[in-house]
Amino acid sequence: MALPTARPLLGSCGTPALGSLLFLLFSLGWVQPSRTLAGETGQEAAPLDGVLANPPNISSLSPRQLLGFPCAEVSGLSTERVRELAVALAQKNVKLSTEQLRCLAHRLSEPPEDLDALPLDLLLFLNPDAFSGPQACTRFFSRITKANVDLLPRGAPERQRLLPAALACWGVRGSLLSEADVRALGGLACDLPGRFVAESAEVLLPRLVSCPGPLDQDQQEAARAALQGGGPPYGPPSTWSVSTMDALRGLLPVLGQPIIRSIPQGIVAAWRQRSSRDPSWRQPERTILRPRFRREVEKTACPSGKKAREIDESLIFYKKWELEACVDAALLATQMDRVNAIPFTYEQLDVLKHKLDELYPQGYPESVIQHLGYLFLKMSPEDIRKWNVTSLETLKALLEVNKGHEMSPQVATLIDRFVKGRGQLDKDTLDTLTAFYPGYLCSLSPEELSSVPPSSIWAVRPQDLDTCDPRQLDVLYPKARLAFQNMNGSEYFVKIQSFLGGAPTEDLKALSQQNVSMDLATFMKLRTDAVLPLTVAEVQKLLGPHVEGLKAEERHRPVRDWILRQRQDDLDTLGLGLQGGIPNGYLVLDLSMQEALSGTPCLLGPGPVLTVLALLLASTLA
């Protein structure tokens, strides 16, 4: 039965742009209302006029409906319309013919901005000169790498202009290529002339193996010479094994008799036998879509005799791809303790890290983490956030790697994970952390410091608190007081001294009764608001013989502010010549008291001292 309209089949209306685009497709004959569609639903396709009356959402069209447009009908379209069409075709992943691609490319006159939205293979037909800047060309050729270059025959002008432009873009000078260069060229590597094969055989031969279509004469001769020369990656033909032959399959037609004669005959026979027995090993048809296993041979096949059954220093001679192919991740994990002692390059360590990441996508187990050694420096904070580190030995081992350096984001993340895992910053942890990073404690927020149990305070050395600010000492002091409470006077003072920057007035008053002889450096670190209420007599007792040092500090806080609060008469009793105290007959009002009474906080904040001249006569006082 015929449908009354196409809407149930094609979906509801989309955006005006998409609607008009579809109208365009139909009107130009690019989209044929496919009758085979009815076969899928058991219903006839909608009449054309139904679709035109209700322009549908393009995403509901099947790729089948987007196939088979003649090029002539595109010539009248605006560039913008052609671009819309190209994007739609990409979204639907419609396979287009060479002619259709060429036609679309020709109509995209200016270089498109959104390369990612266009059909991949369309880029092959765009002029690379239009993407001349370093960023533009990199974007362009990064996409080309993924395109099917073999849509274009070797001799096609579009294909011939791509390789020189790509080489220029990637900054290749001369004929020497790196592994990265070959990767960046993608399918274009198959077009590299013989001189590249001769000079870069080690990285290029494994790529040529998977090139569809025969190599040209120049390439064949260079490949033959390189293979006969016996250099890497395959070595002398006399040492080839069955797996070497497997890896070379795409190049076997170029070998020639001299090479074949020097391959051990047993190997050739074994290889032939296997090829005939197993159809999947026969020379594959040169299809445009290359079988996946052939592309991966170069990446994953470990050369014969190179597989590691044990991690040892011989692996430092491996190229990155050999490490990737020949070292089993599980073996690596169990023998991580060896890696640190072996002088791997940073690039090789990258490969080893990659292997561990693949083996442990949820994060490494502690048995591996403990032995990471220098590989730890390769970890990102994101990697470390996946870890569960509970052993202090593990923490120490990793901090050792970073010893002598500033605390890196990795180390900060590691410590954070460790402390969170333990629930609190215990004494042993604090001991360890402050041994490696004396300023560690002062890098924590007051909130984080609140999780430090008093027992941990025993691990803190005076230098560990050097960079702490008053807010941090406010948190640490009560913990220290609790930790040292059972010590006698002089011992207690020695321990509590470096925490006194967080001590309140009443504790300072109590200390002044114990003849502690506080040095000036400690006094200068006390909280100003805790020092101000102290009397001259209390300060004298607190400092003992060090009281003379007040003169040198009289212009600095908290001494300056304290002097302003004292009666000059009292200051004079010290015999130090301290000036700036309150003259006789002056009254001191504390604004913080006034604020408490009025309930209206002062703009200056609590605690400023207001000195009011009362000029009270003696008679009045009497």
């Epitope: 040492t239 797996s243 096949a301 014969s304 597989k307 590691a308 044990e310 040892d312 060896r338 002692a341």
Partner: antibody, heavy 118, light 111 residues
Framework: EILLQQTGTVLARPGTSVKMSCKAS????????MHWVKQRPGQGLEWIGG????????NYNQKFKDKAKLTAVTSTSTANMELSSLTNEDSAVYYC???????????WGQGTTLTVSS | DIVLTQSPASLAVSLGQRATISCKAS??????????MNWYQQKPGQPPKLLIY???NLESGIPARFSGSGSGTDFTLNIHPVEEEDAATYYC?????????FGGGTKLEVK
């Protein structure tokens, strides 16, 4: 140049113990496994065991587990093998050899000849 | 333990001819695409010397007239053309499984 230097000849009484050494040079001693092999006069080769000096990890042929003890002194790049409860059967040439990736032995010492005789 | 049986126990080959030595394992020595079979040469009064590793890979410094082949349980060492200095005893060794084991040896005489 990679060299494995072994003590030349050792004479011992039955029932006693003997310790032979193998001094390595020309490579990082701690980063390769050192193996030991026994060869009786006119006979084949028998693998005794190996030690990875970097962490003292050892593996033994069960046949020699109670006979041989492998140790390594990293400070002097020396591998040692102690053979206990000696009998005439222990008279042989003992080779130390460097293992590669757990797959093969690329360098061999000159051998220590042990003679057990009363 | 894996038992390696070498044959022949001895052979005499004329100068310039081919010598073929066989080594059969009591079970496969293949693992993950590699054959863990190695060949050594030993001359009187000397330690053995590595010739071939992983069945077919020539150790560096060893002349190309030595070649190895095979997989699974059957392995072959070929020497062609044989030279006078090749007179020695040849041993196969498997490293696929602990304990590593050696063949009984094949004594090659050059005529």
């Amino acid at each position: 140049e990679i060299l494995l230097q072994q003590t030349g000849t050792v004479l011992a009484r039955p029932g006693t113990s003997v310790k032979m050494s193998c001094k390595a040079s020309g490579y990082t001693f701690t980063n390769y496994r050192m193996h030991w092999v026994k060869q009786r006069p006119g006979q084949g080769l028998e693998w005794i065991g190996g030690i990875y000096p970097g962490n003292s990890d050892t593996n033994y042929n069960q046949k020699f587990k109670d006979k041989a003890k492998l140790t390594a002194v990293t400070s002097t790049s020396t591998a040692n093998m102690e053979l206990s409860s000696l009998t005439n059967e222990d008279s042989a040439v003992y080779y130390c050899l460097r293992g590669i990736r757990g797959s093969y032995f690329d360098y061999w010492g000159q051998g220590t000849t042990l003679t057990v005789s009363s | 333990d894996i038992v390696l049986t070498q044959s022949p126990a001895s052979l005499a080959v004329s100068l310039g001819q081919r010598a073929t030595i066989s080594c059969k394992a009591s079970q496969s020595v293949d693992y993950d695409g590699d054959s863990y079979m190695n060949w050594y040469q030993q001359k009187p009064g000397q330690p053995p010397k590595l010739l071939i590793y992983a069945a077919s890979n020539l150790e560096s410094g060893i002349p190309a007239r030595f070649s190895g082949s095979g997989s699974g349980t059957d392995f072959t060492l070929n020497i062609h053309p044989v030279e006078e200095e090749d007179a020695a005893t040849y041993y196969c060794q498997q490293s696929n499984e602990d304990p590593s084991t050696f063949g009984g040896g094949t004594k090659l005489e050059v005529k």
